[in-house]
Interface confidence: low
C-alpha cells in the first residue's frame, strides 16, 4: 500500500512565438484544475482506457481574468498535492497522464463549461520511496512543470511497497534510524546503505552497496543525465578522435527485460524487475492468472482448467475488452438531445447544450415556454423552438385568448342541431339518428347498427359530448 503524489509547479504558455496569452476564452474569466491518471506498465494505451492504478482530481484553482497588455504569466494553480493511493504493490513501471482542464465561469446556460486544455502522457519507471522526480512537458503551446514520487504507507517498505514492517509491542532495542521489520522478531533492519557516492537525488537502492538510477539518469552513481554526451560515460575504451570514453556494451544495454521489465546491473550480469503477471530471467514468461487480478473495473475473472492457466474476464456493463479495460463509448448512444455535445467524463456523462436548451440531456427548450402563459386554462407545449398552446375547449389562437365557437365547424351530422355548452358542445339529433355527433342511423325496428343506446336514452334525445 502507498500513495503516488504529484505536485504541479507551473502551467503556462510555452516558449516561442504563437504561445497563447490566456487559457480563458473570450467569454470571460476561467479557472484551472488538473486530473492525474495512472495506468500500469509502459504500454501505449488508448486514451480512453481506464486508470487502472487510480486517478485523482485537483481542487479548482483561483479565478483568472486576462489582463490586457500584461505579459502572459504562469497561471494561478490549485493548492496542494494530487494524491493517488494504491492498495497493492507499486508496479515500478507506469504511464502517467496529466490533464489540464479549464472551467469557464462566464454566463453559461446550465452552469460552468469544462474543456480539456492540455494533456501530457509519460511512460515512466519509478521506485517507491525514491526522491521527487522533476519533469517539464510541452502539450501543444502549453508547458507544464511538475514533480512526482511514490511512497509506501501503512508499514509497507521496499521499492514496490510489498514488504511489511510491523512495530514491536515492546520498546525497540535498536539504535536510531533502524526499524523493526517482520518477520525478524528480535532483529532490526537498517535501511540499505547505497554504494558510496550514489546520488541522493537521482539514485536509490534496495540492497546494500548498489546504486539504481531513476528515469533520466545514468552512470554508476546516477549522476549523469541520460541525454548527455557519452563523453561523460565511465565504461569502455577511449576514442582517439574525441578523447571521449566510448561506452562499451553493458549488461542492460538494449534492455534485455521483456514485457516492460526494468533492468538493473549486477556485477557482470543483470537483473530484471518484472511487472505484475510476468516472471522469468527476462520477464519473458506470461503467467497471468486470476490471482494477479487482471480484470479491471470490477470484471469477474474466470480461470482456465487448472490453477496455472490463463483467464477470461467477464465485464460489467459499461466496460469491454479482454481485461475490461475499455470503457464503452457512452456518447455513441447520443444521449444529448437537441444537438447537445456529449462529454464522457469517466465518472459521469455531461451534455453541453446549445443556446436555448438546458437540462441534464438538453431536453428543455428554454425558448419555448419560459415566461409564456397560455390563457383560459391552455397548456404550453415545447418543441421546434417556438412555444405552442394546446387550448381548452371553446378557446383558440396562439395564446388561447380568442373565443372559439365549438359549433362553427358544424360537428352534428344528419341535420342535428349544435348547442354550445360550458364543457363542450351538445348535438340534438334529427329523428332516426343518434350518437354524440348524430353519426349513427337508427333502424326502423328501433335497433341501431352498433350496440343499443344506453338505457334511458332514446334516439333523438340530445347527447352531450364530453
Amino acid at each position: 500500500a502507498g500513495v503516488f503524489e504529484l505536485q504541479i509547479h507551473s502551467f503556462g504558455p510555452g516558449p516561442g512565438p504563437g504561445a497563447p496569452r490566456s487559457p480563458c476564452s473570450a467569454r470571460g474569466p476561467c479557472r484551472l484544475f488538473f486530473r492525474v491518471c495512472l495506468k500500469p506498465g509502459l504500454s501505449e494505451e488508448a486514451a480512453e482506457s481506464p486508470c487502472a492504478l487510480g486517478a485523482a482530481l485537483s481542487a479548482r484553482g483561483p479565478v483568472y481574468t486576462e489582463q490586457p497588455e500584461a505579459p502572459a504569466p504562469d497561471l494561478p494553480l490549485p493548492n496542494g498535492l494530487l494524491q493517488v493511493p494504491f492498495r497493492d504493490a507499486w508496479p515500478g513501471t507506469f504511464s502517467l497522464i496529466i490533464e489540464t482542464w479549464r472551467e469557464e465561469l462566464g454566463d453559461q446556460i446550465g452552469g460552468p463549461a469544462w474543456s480539456l486544455l492540455a494533456r501530457v502522457t509519460r511512460r515512466r519507471r519509478l521506485a517507491a520511496g525514491g526522491p521527487w522526480a522533476r519533469d517539464i512537458q510541452r502539450a501543444g503551446a502549453w508547458e507544464l512543470r511538475f514533480s512526482y514520487r511514490a511512497r509506501c504507507e501503512l508499514l509497507a517498505v521496499g521499492t514496490a511497497c510489498t514488504r511489511l514492517c510491523r512495530p514491536r509491542s515492546a520498546p525497540s532495542r535498536c539504535g536510531p534510524g533502524l526499524r523493526p521489520c517482520a518477520p525478524l522478531e528480535d532483529e532490526c533492519e537498517a535501511p540499505p546503505v547505497c554504494r558510496a557516492g550514489c546520488s541522493l537525488e537521482h539514485g536509490f537502492c534496495e540492497q546494500p552497496g548498489e546504486c539504481r538510477c531513476l528515469e533520466g539518469w545514468t552512470g554508476p552513481l546516477c549522476t549523469v543525465p541520460a541525454s548527455t554526451s557519452s563523453c561523460l560515460g565511465l565504461r569502455g575504451p577511449s576514442s582517439a578522435t574525441t578523447g571521449c570514453l566510448v561506452p562499451g556494451p553493458g549488461p542492460c544495454d538494449g534492455n534485455p527485460c521483456a514485457n516492460g521489465g526494468s533492468c538493473s546491473e549486477t556485477p557482470g550480469s543483470f537483473e530484471c524487475t518484472c511487472p505484475r503477471g510476468f516472471y522469468g530471467l527476462r520477464c519473458e514468461v506470461s503467467g497471468v492468472t486470476c490471482a494477479d487480478g487482471p480484470c479491471f473495473n470490477g470484471g469477474l475473472c474466470v480461470g482456465g482448467a487448472d490453477p496455472d492457466s490463463a483467464y477470461i474476464c467477464h465485464c460489467p456493463p459499461g466496460f469491454q475488452g479482454s481485461n475490461c479495460e475499455k470503457r464503452v463509448d457512452r456518447c455513441s448512444l447520443q444521449p444529448c438531445r437537441n444537438g447537445g455535445l456529449c462529454l464522457d467524463l469517466g465518472h459521469a456523462l455531461r451534455c453541453r447544450c446549445r443556446a436555448g436548451f438546458a437540462g441534464p440531456r438538453c431536453e428543455h427548450n428554454l425558448d419555448d415556454c419560459a415566461g409564456r402563459a397560455c390563457a383560459n386554462g391552455g397548456t404550453c407545449v415545447e418543441g421546434g423552438g417556438a412555444h405552442r398552446c394546446s387550448c381548452a375547449l371553446g378557446f383558440g389562437g396562439r395564446d388561447c385568448r380568442e373565443r372559439a365557437d365549438p359549433c362553427a365547424a358544424r360537428p352534428c351530422a344528419h341535420g342535428g342541431r349544435c348547442y354550445a355548452h360550458f364543457s363542450g358542445l351538445v348535438c340534438a339529433c334529427a329523428p332516426g339518428y343518434m350518437g354524440s355527433r348524430c353519426e349513427f342511423p337508427v333502424h326502423p325496428d328501433g335497433v341501431s347498427a352498433l350496440p343499443a343506446a344506453p338505457p334511458g336514452l332514446r334516439p333523438g334525445d340530445p347527447q352531450r359530448y364530453l
Epitope: P40, G41, L42, S43, E44, A258, N259, G260, P275, G277, F278, G280, R282, E284, V285, S286, G287, V288, P294, A310, I312, G321, S322, N323, E325
Partner: nanobody, 117 residues
Framework: QVQLVESGGGSVQAGGSLRLSCAAS???????MAWYRQAPGKERELVSR???????NYAASVKGRFTISQDNAKNTVYLQMNSLNPGDTGMYYC????????????WGNGILVTVSS
C-alpha cells in the same frame, strides 16, 4: 488487425490422434498463444498455453496426452492431441495474448474436433 487461422480439426475414433495448427498474423509484442476448448453446454476452458520463450502449461485433463509447440518463424502454434477420448470433443479455439502488458486477447473462429467411441 490480428488474424488467427485454425486448421486440422475433424472426426476421429477414440484412441486416435489429431494435430491442430493456428497461424497468427497482424500483431506485435506477442506474449503467449493458447488453445481453449468448449464442449457443448460447458464453459470455455484452457487446454494448453505456450509463451514466446517456450514456457508451457496444460490442463490437468490433457497432461501427458497433448503437446503444444510453436514455430516462431512461421508465427504458428500446434497442438498435437494423442489418445483422444469422447470427453475431448468440442470446439477448439486458438488464442493469442499480445501487448506490452499482455492484456489483449484475440480469438480464432474455432475448429470442431469430434471423438467417437
Amino acid at each position: 488487425q490480428v488474424q488467427l487461422v485454425e486448421s486440422g480439426g475433424g472426426s476421429v475414433q477414440a484412441g486416435g490422434s489429431l494435430r491442430l495448427s493456428c497461424a497468427a498474423s497482424g500483431y506485435t509484442d506477442r506474449c503467449s498463444m493458447a488453445w481453449y476448448r468448449q464442449a457443448p453446454g460447458k464453459e470455455r476452458e484452457l487446454v494448453s498455453r505456450i509463451s514466446t520463450s517456450g514456457f508451457t502449461n496444460y490442463a490437468a485433463s490433457v497432461k501427458g496426452r497433448f503437446t503444444i509447440s510453436q514455430d516462431n518463424a512461421k508465427n504458428t502454434v500446434y497442438l498435437q492431441m494423442n489418445s483422444l477420448n469422447p470427453g475431448d470433443t468440442g470446439m477448439y479455439y486458438c488464442a493469442i495474448i499480445v501487448g506490452r502488458t499482455c492484456s489483449l486477447n484475440y480469438w480464432g473462429n474455432g475448429i470442431l474436433v469430434t471423438v467417437s467411441s
